[in-house]
């Protein structure tokens, strides 16, 4: 069938999700599309435990996640509710800073060197993390 029962080669399984960590950089939209071509999405962080797992794997490097406010409100790429969900912004972030001189504000979220989140210009070529969930069908215990 089409169910994903285990993680693809070079992906890391954790808590019934698969994660892939880039070692090169792309703009946020290109990283997002890369993940989509892997039938995945940019990582969506839903808990402190998941935050620590991702942070452990990426190290102290700016890395895109699946969170943006390009259309107004902050949104997770998989539809997870932002307002009620886990957040780990740096103090005084997000600030939609216009002072970078690149035009516009800051609409895409990334992990910073200490793991906390910052909003930045979406065109910056940062590393990224893809995530895909193992299928619900494969999570059910076998019938005895």
């Amino acid at each position: 069938g089409s169910e994903r029962t285990c993680c693809p080669v070079n992906w890391v399984e954790h808590e019934r999700s698969c994660y892939w960590f880039s070692r090169s950089g792309k703009a946020w939209a290109d990283a997002d599309n890369y993940c989509r071509l892997e039938d995945a999405h940019l990582v969506v962080v839903t808990s402190w435990e998941e935050q620590k797992f991702v942070q452990h794997h990426i190290g102290p490097v700016n890395t895109w996640m699946g969170l943006h406010d390009q259309n107004g409100p902050w949104k997770w790429v998989d539809g997870t509710d932002y307002e009620t969900g886990f957040k780990n912004w740096r103090p005084e972030q997000p600030d939609d800073w216009y002072g970078h001189g690149l035009g516009g504000g800051e609409d895409c979220a990334h992990f910073t060197d200490d793991g906390r989140w910052n909003d930045d210009v979406c065109q910056r070529p940062y590393r990224w993390v893809c995530e895909t969930e193992l299928d619900k069908a494969s999570q059910e215990p076998p019938l005895l």
Partner: antibody
């Protein structure tokens, strides 16, 4: 031997439709994003469309968006390109190609032999 | 869109020559650059990916270098089967990959 084999090309009038097929053999088809790339006579290569391995995500070049539809049937190891509202500028050899993804880099590593599409009245 | 240019558009060389083809991107693409070879009436074949990684089965006389906007494909000791057209391609803008116009290598 890993192989991609296109079919379905031919002569069609402007405004007409055509469906191209690409049959894959000897590799795990559903694990790979698949693409269509075209080459007009005597010119360079133009990326047309791509679809993810499980078929959930598709992308198109601006030049074909709204007219072409990419799809796949993993049970048949086959990729498709439905081409509607064809124009003279769509005349080209159409290649299917598989996407190699290594450490974040992407390339087209396996290509079919191509099928010729001619749009003319 | 990212524009790709190649130079020269064509060149004449002899068997045994060292041939260099350059490719330039309209903006920085890091190392997201591939090289393909195409012979008349045939499909392209992948030679180099990620600017300098040799695709499996490709002879070691082919090599790639560069990053940012400027890239080079080098063929050391040109062989008779290397007379073909060579295309570069950027893969930074996933999946809106664009190709260079090509460089035709023919016999002097």
């Amino acid at each position: 031997e890993v192989q991609l084999l296109e079919s379905g090309g031919g002569l069609v009038q402007p405004g007409g439709s055509l469906r191209l097929s690409c049959a894959a053999s000897e590799f795990t088809f559903s694990s790979y994003a698949m693409s269509w790339v075209r080459q007009a006579p005597g010119t360079g290569l133009e990326w047309v469309s791509i679809i993810s391995g499980r078929g959930g995500n598709t992308f198109y070049a601006d030049s074909v968006k709204g007219r072409f539809t990419i799809s796949r049937d993993n049970s048949k190891n086959t990729l498709y390109l439905q081409m509607n509202s064809l124009r003279a500028e769509d005349t080209a050899v159409y290649y299917c190609a598989s996407r190699l993804a290594v450490a974040g880099s992407e390339a087209f590593d396996i290509w079919g032999q191509g099928t010729m599409v001619t749009v003319s009245s | 869109d990212i524009q790709m240019t190649q130079s020269p558009s064509s060149l004449s060389a002899s068997v045994g020559d060292r041939v260099t083809i350059t490719c330039r991107a309209s903006q920085s693409i890091s190392s997201y650059l591939n090289w393909y070879q195409q012979k008349p009436g045939k499909a392209p074949t992948l030679l180099i990916y990620a600017a300098s990684s040799l695709q499996s089965g490709v002879p070691s006389r082919f090599s790639g270098s560069g990053s940012g906007t400027d890239f080079t494909l080098t063929i050391n000791s040109l062989q008779p089967e290397d007379f073909a057209t060579y295309f570069c391609q950027q893969s930074y803008r996933t999946p809106f990959f664009t190709f260079g116009p090509g460089t035709k290598v023919d016999i002097k």
